[in-house]
Interface confidence: low
């Protein structure tokens, strides 16, 4: 069937439209286009004869139409009047006619809209504002946007006048936003520039900051006032009802008790004509004296002396507080406070009691701290430590030993070699040592205040060869699945590589094996009975190498669940019952038997001659390992049948 399609159907003024013909019959003589829904000679636009390819304009031809051989009609520079129906009249070669009608609509291109307002400065909670989208345009749809979002649902928002007018009732400060309107028709959409609604509000009740209302004499008072307001508020300060100044901040330096009182901030909005006030009460306290600490013993001796610390000055009806190391006082039988907390006594001071100590006096406003006091506790010397810890050196190197002993005042040091005094220094240095420098090296530390002395002796061996190492262990009898064992390869030597073997093999990779201390220490975590092996350590430097004798680890384990043999549970009357119990255990466990819960004998083997059915019952073997402290047991049921009725036997 012959049809007309308009492309596009909605056409913008000034654009073009194509009336496209579908299903055009064969064997045509020609065709004509008409304006309207019927064939009317007065409204013919154009005719076309196929044979001559001649187009003839009609009365309704405007000069903007072009006809195509396929009968389609293009209309250019569309005007509003072009809206409507168009009819195609087709004349076939057999002079039979066919008609089809199509249509399109013409719309104007919309101009950019703008917003007009009936109130440029509405007052919060009082005024309404009506926005109108200009210009008024026929066949246009109006839309509104707030902060680029579609209109929220609100009883205070109302659309009218075909959505052209947006009214905000009872405006609030939250209505301060960007408003845009949009006009739409089938061929265009345009959005206005934004209009910012300027809502006048406030002032709200002012806020005075800081919130602090208590001050010390001599401080500066600096109060700031703020109230939400549009336009910004104008501020005034009143002290005890008397006007002070018209500023947002009030500053009074070096205040005294006389500055105590009520401080009022007034906020005024000149546009809304509203005033709001807030009052705060300021209290100024007199400054108490700064406390200080006195001590009855400035150089106490560790483990001998007591020290009494007193917080000065003495003030009636005052709370005294104490701190040690910036913490409140720990609970300790060596710390005692007097009834008024003013005196803190340290009984039998230690080096850890040096402090610092602070005391404080509490007043209505705050706590005043004293300067910290540090105790000079005399102690030591402790046993000196000689470093480095090496005991083995190669000839030709320099020997540099350092001695240190904890002591106050610091210790004075002396060095002796094989009992002969060498020098009074903390460090001993001997260059280019030989085997002759082997011997006993003694460091003596002396505390001049206490007169105490302590010594440490170290054996130094100077040899070109590494000695045969040995293995020391921190646990000679570890318990399985419980203990760890640390093997250390001795001695510690400079520039030496330490190595380990287990049963003649290099160390297996295992999360339970850990090397530390420069590979000198091998730790076995959570030992198992499989760790009972031969361990060897080796030492190597660029001159020589050596291996230790093996050390076999004796792992205590068990007892495991025992096994009773033979496995038989059925016996004939008159037979001998000979049960043997075995449990894997190190050391070997102690065995005991119970028959039907009754203790029997403490042996590994239970023997009963010529059993009878009376010997039926439960036979329990108990094992205990005194070294591991662990126990285990197993129960076996024994059935004794009268002769000739043994289960499983038949005539």
């Amino acid at each position: 069937k012959l049809t007309i399609e308009s492309t596009p159907f909605n056409v913008a003024e000034g654009k073009e439209v194509l009336l496209l013909v579908h299903n055009l019959p064969q064997h045509l003589f020609g065709y004509s286009w008409y304006k309207g829904e019927r064939v009317d000679g007065n409204r013919q636009i154009i005719g076309y004869v196929i044979g001559t390819q001649q187009a003839t304009p009609g009365p309704a031809y405007s000069g903007r139409e072009i006809i195509y051989p396929n009968a389609s009609l293009l209309i250019q520079n569309i005007i509003q009047n072009d809206t409507g129906f168009y009819t195609l009249h087709v004349i076939k070669s057999d002079l039979v006619n066919e008609e089809a009608t199509g249509q399109f609509r013409v719309y104007p291109e919309l101009p950019k809209p703008s917003i007009s307002s009936n109130n440029s400065k509405p007052v919060e909670d009082k005024d309404a504002v009506a926005f109108t989208c200009e210009p008024e345009t026929q066949d246009a749809t109006y839309l509104w946007w707030v902060n680029n979002q579609s209109l929220p649902v609100s009883p205070r928002l109302q659309l009218s006048n075909g959505n052209r007018t947006l009214t905000l009732f009872n405006v609030t400060r939250n209505d301060t936003a960007s408003y845009k309107c949009e006009t739409q028709n089938p061929v265009s959409a345009r959005r206005s520039d934004s209009v910012i609604l300027n809502v006048l509000y406030g002032p709200d009740a002012p806020t005075i900051s800081p919130l602090n209302t208590s001050y010390r004499s001599g401080e500066n008072l600096n109060l700031s006032c703020h109230a939400a307001s549009n336009p910004p508020a104008q501020y005034s300060w009143f002290v005890n009802g008397t006007f002070q100044q018209s500023t947002q901040e009030l500053f009074i330096p070096n205040i005294t008790v006389n500055n105590s009182g009520s401080y009022t901030c007034q906020a005024h909005n000149s546009d809304t004509g509203l005033n709001r006030t807030t009052v705060t009460t300021i209290t100024v306290y007199a400054e108490p004296p700064k406390p200080f600490i006195t001590s009855n013993n400035s150089n106490p001796v560790e483990d001998e002396d007591a020290v009494a610390l007193t917080c000065e000055p003495e003030i009636q009806n005052t709370t005294y507080l104490w701190w040690v190391n910036n913490q409140s006082l720990p609970v300790s039988p060596r710390l005692q406070l007097s009834n008024d907390n003013r005196t803190l006594t340290l009984l039998s001071v230690t080096r850890n009691d040096v402090g610092p100590y602070e005391c404080g006096i509490q007043n209505e406003l705050s706590v005043d701290h004293s300067d910290p006091v540090i105790l000079n506790v005399l102690y030591g010397p402790d046993d000196p430590t000689i470093s480095p810890s090496y005991t083995y050196y190669r000839p030709g190197v320099n020997l540099s030993l350092s001695c240190h002993a904890a002591s106050n005042p610091p210790a004075q040091y002396s060095w002796l070699i094989d009992g002969n005094i060498q020098q009074h220094t903390q460090e001993l240095f001997i260059s280019n040592i030989t085997e002759k420098n082997s011997g006993l090296y003694t460091c003596q530390a002396n505390n001049s205040a206490s007169g105490h002395s302590r010594t440490t002796v170290k054996t130094i061996t100077v040899s070109a060869e590494l000695p045969k190492p040995s293995i020391s262990s921190n646990n000679s009898k570890p318990v399985e699945d419980k203990d760890a064992v640390a093997f250390t390869c001795e001695p510690e030597a400079q520039n030496t590589t330490y190595l380990w073997w287990v049963n003649g093999q290099s160390l297996p990779v295992s999360p339970r094996l850990q090397l530390s201390n420069g590979n000198r220490t091998l730790t076995l975590f959570n030992v198992t009975r499989n760790d009972a092996r031969a361990y060897v350590c080796g030492i190597q430097n660029s001159v020589s190498a050596n291996r230790s004798d093996p050390v076999t680890l004796d792992v205590l384990y068990g007892p495991d669940t025992p096994i009773i043999s033979p496995p038989d549970s059925s016996y004939l009357s008159g037979a001998n019952l000979n049960l043997s119990c075995h449990s894997a255990s190190n050391p070997s466990p102690q065995y005991s038997w119970r028959i039907n819960g009754i203790p029997q004998q403490h042996t590994q083997v239970l023997f009963i001659a010529k059993i009878t059915p009376n010997n039926n019952g439960t036979y329990a073997c108990f094992v205990s390992n005194l070294a591991t402290g662990r126990n285990n047991s197993i129960v076996k049921s024994i059935t004794v049948s009268a002769s000739g009725t043994s289960p499983g036997l038949s005539a």
Partner: antibody, heavy 116, light 108 residues
Framework: DVQLVQSGGGLVQPGGSLRLSCAGS????????MSWLRQAPGKGLEWVAN????????NYVDSVKGRFTISRDNAQNSLYLQMSSLRAEDTAVYYC?????????WGQGTLLTVSP | EIVLTQSPGTLSLSPGERATLSCRAS???????LAWYQQRPGQAPRLLIY???SRATGVPDRFSGSGSGTDFTLTISRLEAEDFAMYHC?????????FGQGTMVDIK
């Protein structure tokens, strides 16, 4: 100074025997593992055998096991390698050296030639 | 046994240049137990490096060793006349002790 002086090389027929010696000075040999190594003409080094301080532990490369014996005399500060059932492939410069893992002092080397 | 492969077989350089010698093991070497030796013509080998990176007594600091696992390197930062020689690597992580076939550093 550590010194290792070797002796005993020479020409031997296949199947023959020979003993190499190595005399140490400047160190206490009873504190050191000792080793024998060899280097065939134009080839790389090959470890042959070693012995611990008191002679109770000995190790050999597979190719000489059962044919070579390493020994020591700590009183003489001496190391020995007794070689028997010699083969043409044993032809090499033989070195004695001090050490269990690495070899920090070496003898001057002695040439063993096994040839008919 | 662990097989050591040294590369290159020969390294031709001039005095003052940097030499980088490689030693690759057929399997992981325990505890970085690898040593390097220098052997001049007609002389016994001399220990340079042990434990992969520790210099032996009296070895100049222009010799340095690095590496772990299966890949090891000997570096001579600035070659001097006496450094032109054969260099051997040796593993001592397992028996038998084995050596590489050697790298010859000669004058270009």
């Amino acid at each position: 100074d550590v010194q290792l002086v070797q002796s005993g090389g020479g020409l031997v027929q296949p199947g023959g025997s020979l003993r190499l010696s190595c005399a140490g000075s400047g160190f206490t040999s009873s504190l050191s593992w000792m080793s024998w190594l060899r280097q065939a003409p134009g080839k790389g080094l090959e470890w042959v055998a070693n012995i611990n301080q008191d002679g109770s532990e000995k190790n050999y490369v597979d190719s000489v096991k059962g044919r070579f014996t390493i020994s020591r005399d700590n009183a003489q500060n001496s190391l020995y390698l007794q070689m028997s059932s010699l083969r043409a492939e044993d032809t090499a410069v033989y070195y004695c050296a001090r050490g269990l893992w690495t070899f920090d002092s070496w003898g001057q080397g002695t040439l063993l030639t096994v040839s008919p | 046994e662990i097989v050591l492969t040294q590369s290159p077989g020969t390294l031709s350089l001039s005095p003052g240049e940097r030499a980088t010698l490689s030693c690759r093991a057929s399997q992981n070497i325990n505890n970085r137990f690898l040593a390097w030796y220098q052997q001049r013509p007609g002389q016994a080998p001399r220990l340079l490096i042990y434990a992969a990176s520790s210099r032996a007594t009296g070895v100049p600091d222009r010799f340095s060793g690095s590496g772990s696992g299966t890949d090891f390197t000997l570096t001579i930062s600035r070659l001097e006349a006496e450094d032109f020689a054969m260099y051997h690597c040796q593993q001592y992580g397992s028996f038998p002790r084995t050596f590489g076939q050697g790298t010859m550093v000669d004058i270009k």
